[in-house]
């Protein structure tokens, strides 16, 4: 049984909260798109599945999570959009062939501590930064 | 004539520099893909094109730039990949249907100063954060 698992939930889009721009928000520009809005998805990663079980002693895996979903106009408040992402969204609407939508990426990442063997077979406890996604946004 | 422009250059991928993982790098796993690796693209945004000329006095536009490109295995040193992105890349390869590749997003953003009319027609000079992409990475 594979121990890397993910759960998928749907989430409604709310209206857009803009800092940089006074933009009249289309009520639901991307209602035709079936992909949900940018959000955090749960993902448990097993170090065995990654083939790292021979050098990582503990933990056996961790809740890494990941970001996925659309960053479409209008960007709502939950999307933690940067000012640049708001501008890029509008430019994408005008020039979809040339400029992509902003992408759904981690906005907050946490560290985890890992106990592992180094190249000399010493047991090391090390904190690895930016391993766990805590929040996502449109960037 | 749209004054939002972008220039695209190709960029070679180098081998992957990993912090979190001891992973042997496939020499060119995604050579068949035509999209270039994650990088910054130049983009000039005209406020007139965005329809903001009536309230933004100056500047007339600015070099916003944007991020685009593949975040494929192996992630090279130029891609400023987080540890999470490295893990996600591997999970994507094992489960491409379920977990996307990391996305190419801004890693450094700069502010610009904008002179504009507020709702009461006062002239305001305000610094808008996170308006200009200075660097991109796989997140």
């Amino acid at each position: 049984s594979a121990s890397s698992r993910r759960r998928q939930q749907s989430r409604n889009r709310s209206t857009q909260s803009q800092d940089v721009a006074r933009v009249s928000s289309a009520s639901d520009y991307n209602s035709s798109e079936l992909k949900t809005a940018c959000r955090k998805h749960e993902l448990y990663v097993s170090f065995q599945d990654l083939g790292w079980q021979d050098w990582i002693i503990a933990p056996k895996g961790y809740a890494a999570n990941y970001c996925d979903g659309e960053c479409s106009f209008p960007l709502n408040a939950h999307m933690n959009a940067t000012n640049h992402a708001i501008v890029q969204t509008l430019v994408h609407l005008m020039n979809p062939e040339y400029v992509p939508k902003p992408c759904c990426a981690p906005t907050k990442l946490n560290a985890i501590s890992v106990l592992y063997f180094d190249d000399n077979s010493n047991v090391i406890l090390k904190k690895y930064r930016n391993m766990v996604v805590r929040a996502c946004g449109c960037h | 004539s749209a004054s939002s422009r972008r220039r695209q250059q190709s960029r070679n991928r180098s081998t992957q520099s990993q912090d979190v993982a001891r992973v042997s790098s496939a020499s060119d796993y995604n050579s068949s893909e035509l999209k270039t690796a994650c990088r910054k693209h130049e983009l000039y945004v005209s406020f007139q094109d965005l329809g903001w000329q009536d309230w933004i006095i100056a500047p007339k536009g600015y070099a916003a730039n944007y991020c685009d490109g593949e975040c494929s295995f192996p992630l090279n040193a130029h891609m400023n990949a987080t540890n999470h992105a490295i893990v996600q890349t591997l999970v994507h390869l094992m489960n491409p249907e379920y977990v996307p590749k990391p996305c190419c997003a801004p890693t450094k953003l700069n502010a610009i100063s904008v002179l504009y009319f507020d709702d009461n027609s006062n002239v305001i000079l305000k610094k808008y954060r996170n308006m200009v992409v200075r660097a991109c990475g796989c997140h």
Epitope: S4, Q8, K35, D49, G51, D68 | Y29, E97
Partner: antibody, heavy 118, light 107 residues
Framework: QVQLVQSGAEVKKPGSSVKVSCKAS????????MHWVRQAPGQGLEWMGY????????KYNENFKGRVTITADESTSTAYMELSSLRSEDTAVYYC???????????WGQGTLVTVSS | DIQMTQSPSSLSASVGDRVTITCRSS??????LAWYQQKPGKAPKLLIY???NLADGVPSRFSGSGSGTDFTLTISSLQPEDFATYYC?????????FGGGTKVEIK
């Protein structure tokens, strides 16, 4: 029980299109990716592409040069594979197969024979 | 694209024999390999996933080993119902690629 039931055999003319269906039952349709694999007579297995019914994400084998389209209907728990611009070399048995996260193709349809002949 | 090379393409064996089939990947795919059994006129059946994990309901005489680029499917004691064609499959990005198959025939 978990099963995938495919539509019946088809005979098609070169240049036409075929749409094969795959009805899933016994599990939550949107929780598993659906792949399509074909097998020409006496030949091996060739992966065509997949769909994730949850988000409609698709990926295709470039060998089919835009001729293949995979869709899914959540309301009927059915996946579809459409192949256009058919030629005689497309004569094959077409299979749908479920692939759970972290696993391989664990459940397969019975196969649909598509014969392309003038 | 990753290429999967199976050997031998066919073999003859007797009931009770130990049979070994190998699969080589053109790139390191770690443990991301599956084995399938296919009988004439039937759909493939999953035997092994993640290189070594036995699928539900598969007899313990089947086992998988290997990682990286070299993998092996072993049938410890061949049974009459095991005469079939066996395919390996690399699961490492897309396209998902199959080996050419190994036909196990009765000697």
């Amino acid at each position: 029980q978990v099963q995938l039931v495919q539509s019946g055999a088809e005979v098609k003319k070169p240049g036409s299109s075929v749409k094969v269906s795959c009805k899933a039952s016994g599990y939550t349709f949107t929780s598993y990716a659906m792949h399509w694999v074909r097998q020409a007579p006496g030949q091996g297995l060739e992966w065509m592409g997949y769909i994730n019914p949850y988000n409609r994400g698709t990926k295709y084998n470039e060998n089919f040069k835009g001729r293949v389209t995979i869709t899914a209907d959540e309301s009927t728990s059915t996946a579809y594979m459409e192949l256009s611009s058919l030629r005689s070399e497309d004569t094959a048995v077409y299979y749908c197969a479920r692939r759970p996260f972290g696993n391989a193709m664990d459940i397969w349809g019975q196969g649909t024979l598509v014969t392309v002949s003038s | 694209d990753i290429q999967m090379t199976q050997s031998p393409s066919s073999l003859s064996a007797s009931v009770g024999d130990r049979v070994t089939i190998t699969c080589r990947s053109s790139e390191n795919i770690y443990r991301n390999l599956a084995w399938y059994q296919q009988k004439p006129g039937k759909a493939p059946k999953l035997l092994i996933y993640a290189a070594t994990n036995l699928a539900d309901g598969v007899p313990s005489r089947f086992s998988g080993s290997g990682s990286g680029t070299d993998f092996t499917l072993t049938i410890s004691s061949l049974q009459p119902e095991d005469f079939a064609t066996y395919y390996c499959q690399g699961i490492w990005g897309t396209p998902l690629t199959f080996g050419g198959g190994t036909k196990v025939e009765i000697k």
